[in-house]
């Protein structure tokens, strides 16, 4: 697995650098978890045609994944920071049974899926202290993602990997419209 | 990286339209956020417009409701529809490619640039 952010080896070549913003520290934790969903669709895309079937064929699924919207506050039309920022914390708090569910589907790139999900646990902890309003993040209830993490796991092998390629595709839009969304404030 | 050539500046009077081409070369293009940055004489680059991977759009305010960006993943083009025209729209436009697929309104966040093309506004 590649190493978090603030390890690699540019950083340690370099120990008179300014330290980093919370805002730059946000974004290069977002690029590192986006370029380990890029490693893990790899390995995906290599494994099932998954990749190749259209949006709308994919569309036509259960899973009830976060995805921004106008009322959110992320995009330039209506743009609002603090209900943009509650959106992407609580998007990515529903996000982590999704993350979960990815430990056990990948053979070659076994660390690199665990490195995404630690890696997301450490930027929502970042994102939390930027927040002011925590009290409008709602935490998803355990008992719910406990039993949807049992039922996707139950799936034959297809829906698997199908799961597996939607949640992948689905986070990777969701970081990046968040961090454009953060690129903003 | 991607290589970016731009293409379909020229001169236009003021209230006039144009419409700007970037094609990329060697790269996953649909996989970037692409954009548009412009540089009059005299001044700093700006930020114009941004489309992301999955086709989300931000545009600097002194061009909302004027410019349009869209992007044919097919053709590996990203377009700049420029209308109402004012000669402050005189510079030169550069295509920008960011292989997170985010983009942002700020240089550092793009690692591919074209060599631009002039835009000259007359009044």
């Known amino acids: 697995a590649p190493v978090p952010p603030g390890e690699d080896s540019k950083d340690v070549a370099a120990p008179h650098r300014q330290p980093l913003t919370s805002s730059e520290r946000i974004d290069k934790q977002i690029r590192y978890i986006l370029d380990g969903i890029s490693a893990l669709r790899k390995e995906t895309c290599n494994k099932s045609n998954m990749c190749e079937s259209s949006k709308e064929a994919l569309a036509e699924n259960n899973l009830n994944l976060p995805k921004m919207a106008e009322k959110d506050g992320c995009f330039q039309s209506g743009f609002n920071e603090e209900t943009c920022l509650v959106k992407i914390i609580t998007g990515l708090l529903e996000f982590e049974v999704y993350l979960e569910y990815l430990q056990n589907r990948f053979e070659s790139s076994e660390e690199q899926a665990r490195a995404v999900q630690m890696s997301t646990k450490v930027l929502i902890q970042f994102l939390q202290k930027k927040a002011k309003n925590l009290d409008a993040i709602t935490t998803p209830d355990p008992t719910t993602n406990a039993s949807l993490l049992t039922k996707l796991q139950a799936q034959n092998q297809w829906l698997q990997d199908m799961t597996t390629h939607l949640i992948l595709r689905s986070f990777k839009e969701f970081l990046q419209s968040s961090l454009r969304a953060l690129r903003q404030m | 990286q991607v290589q970016l050539q731009e293409s379909g500046g020229g001169l236009v009077q003021a209230g006039g339209s144009l419409r700007l081409s970037c094609t990329a070369s060697g790269g996953t293009f649909s996989e970037y956020a692409m954009a548009w940055f412009r540089q009059a004489p005299g001044k700093e680059r700006e930020f114009v417009t941004d489309?992301?991977?999955?086709?989300?759009?931000w545009y600097a305010d002194s061009v909302k409701g004027r410019f349009t960006i869209s992007r044919d993943n097919a053709k590996n083009t990203v377009y700049l529809q420029m209308n109402s025209l004012r000669p402050e729209d005189t510079a030169v436009y550069y295509c920008?490619?960011?292989?997170?697929?985010?983009?942002?309104?700020?240089?550092?966040?793009?690692?591919?640039w074209g060599q631009g093309t002039q835009v000259t506004v007359s009044s």
């Open positions: 920008a490619a960011d292989s997170y697929g985010v983009g942002g309104g700020a240089e550092r966040y793009y690692d591919s």
């Open positions: 489309i992301g991977e999955s086709g989300g759009t």
